[in-house]
């Protein structure tokens, strides 16, 4: 009878995945361990069939239609380990006859996800399971936890509510867990942590809430364990007290409403009063903390789309193990980290998108620093060496502020630019919008940078040598949107540049390449090239995989080279249907169309064809 | 530690010639644009000559065009002052110094005394 | 006669506050370029003080300040002690000359 079940089955494992079934199949072979049902339409679980598969260890009925459990339909079940019953409809009347799940005494997770399962008829569904370790109670209607809501659930580590309507956890909601160790209560509806004790709790997800403070519990002796929080998406007024969090590594509050303190705090004893915003800051761990220095250990701290006007001295000050800092979209005027040892491992630090005029790093601070994002500012006369002062850093983004390139030695200045002249470790820098008049000689020596752009600044005037010392090292150059009608660099010399952007100028002329180099991608396009030679393109046909040239005034006749390639399909030309060429009497058509008799006609022989 | 040390000046006739040197240390010599300045003694500072990192580009003061040279050897990390047709008037105290990207001069030697005198 | 001007002697009390003046031309400090201030203690290299107008090197106290408008610049030096009595230097490029000037040098006197 197997034949009648379409079901695959591998070893003991069975899939009857989205077959249509309005019940379980009862032709599947007895010793089954692994049962997939989901995506099909059974109404109702009835110890039989599904008692006959007592080997069954995993079994996925999700997202079917289910509304009715038969009492003791798993208590045949005796190894069963994971269950899911998400996306179905338990909470229609008939699924809470008496016993709901009934004990479930060896499973270990167990998913009822999706189910519009409400506070109350979520108790009389749960039953004794003394193995749970992981619980999904996500996507369902639960408006409120109380102390009798897990019970019998000893051994639970993982506990998932996201995206239910919790306004009460009511005190001692989670104190039969004593192992509860990661919660998820992202996307509900809580505005207050005001009493935090789950001292063993590890991972804690309290995004996208309506939070409005988060308090410890005043436990002097108490060791928390949590290392990751999550408070993104609430509106929280001030930086949550974390003292006692000693732990903590991830700390994510972004998307709130926090400002920090610019004053010291009022009072220097207990909780700060949120007025002063010092509810705020990690400040001072209480007396009986191990630790002595909160949020010491912390390696990733979001703090981006947020009101912060000012980062107080003292706020960095604890941050030792802080890899990454994020404080984009914020209102930040200024920026300091001067002192020596200050953000000592910060890896990765974004400033972008906040109102920066000015940004002072000290010769010795963020010394482990590689990554600088700082585009939407409003920078401009920054201290000199602000960057060559960076040890260690290789990616530089500076795109949209006003920052002026200081030129090399024998062309100094002019006051108020910024040096990268010897910074050793950048690879990727970008000023992109800077409003760059003139780009001096020896702009970039001994800064072997990869990646240059220096895109939308109109006007900018490159200077002979301004790209000098790149030659060995850029692989990627974008010029893009300057007006530039002349390209005083000498391109064939920069001999592992793969991507060369000169959209958006008024070229219309190329240096030769007349020898192989690594060009891959060459954007042309919106400029006034009439003519591609082949003199000057040859050394291109090896490497070249992309040329753009849309928008360009082309010749139909004298770009052999091109129809060449358009012809032979060595390089893959953009709008290979549209790229119009004209003739002498501006006759527009498709370059691709063009004939070599087209061009012999009065005395225009195509010498290149 | 960056340290500069000159050494080669003295005691020589006008019309005579002198040779400078200027050993460099606890820097990347060859990253570096180098000058040399000069104190008479009792006046100012003034600047004699610079060369660009590689040694390409070499610029000159009015006073001693044509007839000092500067040249370095960044396999030596030295940096050289030749000094031809000497006259009383270059007299003075001369200091090698590195440049940074701004042009100012960051590091100083200590400087070796140069006398034209017959 | 050098290319940037400055008083040959300036003097003031300790704690007080002094400034020395640097005035160029439109090919120097009034084309833009950049000024740079050093001190020279007796019988000692000058030392750099003040790069790019306003800029202090670490170690040197924020009791020196430069500022620069025009064809001019300025070193300033509040609660005078008596350890900076020294000749004090500008120095910017030229753009005519080709070439670095320095100022006269001023010799600063604690009184």
């Known amino acids: 009878h197997q034949d009648k079940v379409p079901c695959k089955m591998v070893d003991k494992k069975v899939s009857c995945q989205v077959l249509g079934l309005l019940q379980v199949p009862s032709v599947l072979p007895p010793d089954t361990e692994t049962l997939d049902l989901s995506g099909n339409q059974l109404r109702s679980i009835l110890a039989s069939p599904l008692g006959f598969y007592t080997a069954l260890r995993h079994l996925d009925l999700s997202t079917n239609e289910i509304s009715f459990l038969q009492p003791g339909a798993f208590q045949a079940l005796t190894h069963l380990e994971h269950l899911s019953l998400a996306h179905n409809r338990l909470a229609m009347a008939t699924a809470l006859s008496a016993g709901g799940l009934g004990p479930l005494p060896r499973v270990t997770s167990l998913d009822l996800s999706g189910n519009s399962l409400y506070s109350g008829l979520l108790e009389r569904l749960l039953g004794e399971a003394p193995s749970l370790h992981t619980l999904s109670l996500a996507e369902n209607s639960l408006t409120r936890l109380t102390r009798h809501t897990f019970r019998d659930m000893p051994a639970l580590e993982q506990l998932d509510l996201h995206s239910n309507v919790l306004m009460d956890i009511e005190d001692g909601a989670f104190e039969g867990l004593p192992r509860l160790t990661h919660l998820n209560l992202s996307r509900n509806s809580l505005t207050c942590i005001s009493d935090f004790s789950l001292q063993q709790l590890r991972v804690l997800d309290l995004s996208c809430n309506s939070i409005e403070a988060f308090q410890t519990a005043s436990q002097p002796q108490a060791e928390f364990q949590l290392t990751w929080l999550d408070l993104r998406e609430n509106k929280l007024l001030h930086f949550p007290d974390l003292a006692a969090l000693p732990r903590l590594i991830y700390l994510n509050l972004s998307n709130n409403l926090i400002r920090l303190p610019t004053g010291p705090p009022q009072d220097s004893k207990g909780i700060h009063a949120p007025s002063e915003g010092w509810s705020a800051l990690p400040l001072s761990a209480p007396s009986g903390n191990a630790s002595g220095r909160p949020l010491s250990q912390l390696l990733n701290l979001d703090l981006s789309y947020n009101e912060i006007e000012l980062i107080p001295d003292s706020f960095l000050e604890h941050l030792t193990s802080l890899c990454f800092l994020n404080l984009s979209r914020n209102c930040l005027r200024t920026f300091e980290a001067r002192r020596l040892g200050s953000l000592p491992c910060l890896m990765l630090l974004d400033l972008s998108h906040n109102a920066l005029e000015t940004l002072e790093l000290g010769a010795r601070a963020l010394g482990s620093l590689r990554t600088l994002l700082l585009q939407g500012n409003a920078l401009r006369d920054l201290p000199p060496y602000t960057f060559a002062n960076l040890a260690s850093l290789q990616r530089l983004n500076l795109q949209g502020n006003r920052v002026s390139p200081c030129g090399g030695p024998d062309e100094p200045g002019p006051s108020g630019c910024v040096a990268f002249s010897g910074i050793t470790s950048l690879r990727s820098l970008s000023l992109v919008d800077n409003e760059i008049e003139l780009l001096r000689a020896g702009a970039f020596l001994h800064t072997p940078l990869t990646e240059l752009d220096l895109s939308s600044n109109p006007g900018l005037e490159v200077a002979t040598g301004a790209l000098g010392g790149l030659e060995a090292s850029l692989e990627v150059l974008a010029l893009q949107g300057n007006g530039l009608m002349v390209l005083q660099v000498d391109l064939p010399c920069f001999i592992c540049l793969k991507r060369l952007n000169l959209a958006e100028n008024r070229l219309s002329h190329l240096p030769a390449w007349t020898q192989a180099v690594s060009l891959e991608v060459l954007d042309l396009r919106n400029n006034s090239f009439s003519l591609l030679p082949g003199s000057a393109m040859g050394g291109l046909e090896t490497s070249l995989r992309r040329l753009y040239l849309q928008g360009n005034p082309l010749s139909c006749c004298g770009n052999g080279w091109l129809a060449a390639q358009l012809h032979q399909g060595r390089v893959d030309v953009d709008a290979t249907q549209d790229l119009i060429c004209r003739f002498s009497s501006q006759e527009e058509v498709s370059l691709s169309h063009v004939r070599p008799e087209d061009c012999e006609k009065g005395g225009l022989k195509n010498i290149n064809l | 530690e960056v340290q500069l040390l000159e050494s080669g000046g003295g005691l020589v006739q006008p019309g005579g010639s002198l040779r400078l040197s200027c050993a460099a240390s606890?820097?990347?010599?060859?990253?570096?644009?180098m000058s040399w300045i000069r104190q008479a003694p009792g006046k100012g500072l003034e600047w004699v000559s610079g060369v660009s990192w590689n040694g390409s580009r070499t610029h000159y003061a009015d006073s001693v065009k044509g007839r000092f040279t500067i040249s370095r050897d960044n396999s030596k990390n030295t940096l050289y002052l030749q000094m031809n047709s000497l006259r009383a008037e270059d007299t003075a105290v001369y200091y090698c110094?590195?440049?940074?990207?701004?042009?100012?001069?960051?590091?100083w030697g200590q400087g070796t005394l140069v006398t034209v005198s017959s | 006669q050098s290319v940037l001007t400055q008083p040959p002697s300036a003097s003031g009390t300790p704690g007080q506050r002094v400034t020395i003046s640097c005035t160029g031309s439109s090919s120097n400090i009034g084309a833009g370029y950049v000024v740079h201030w050093y001190q020279q203690l007796p019988g000692t290299a000058p030392k750099l003080l003040i790069y790019?107008?306003?800029n202090r090197p670490s170690g040197v106290p924020d009791r020196f300040s430069g500022s620069k408008s025009g064809t001019s610049a300025s070193l300033a030096i509040s609660g005078l002690r008596s350890e900076d009595e020294a000749d004090y230097y500008c120095?910017?490029?030229?753009?005519?000359?080709?070439?670095?000037?320095f100022g006269g040098g001023t010799k600063l006197t604690v009184l």
């Open positions: 790019a107008d306003t």
């Open positions: 120095q910017s490029y030229d753009s005519s000359l080709r070439g670095w000037v």
């Open positions: 606890g820097f990347t010599f060859s990253d570096y644009y």
């Open positions: 110094a590195r440049q940074r990207q701004l042009a100012e001069f960051d590091y």
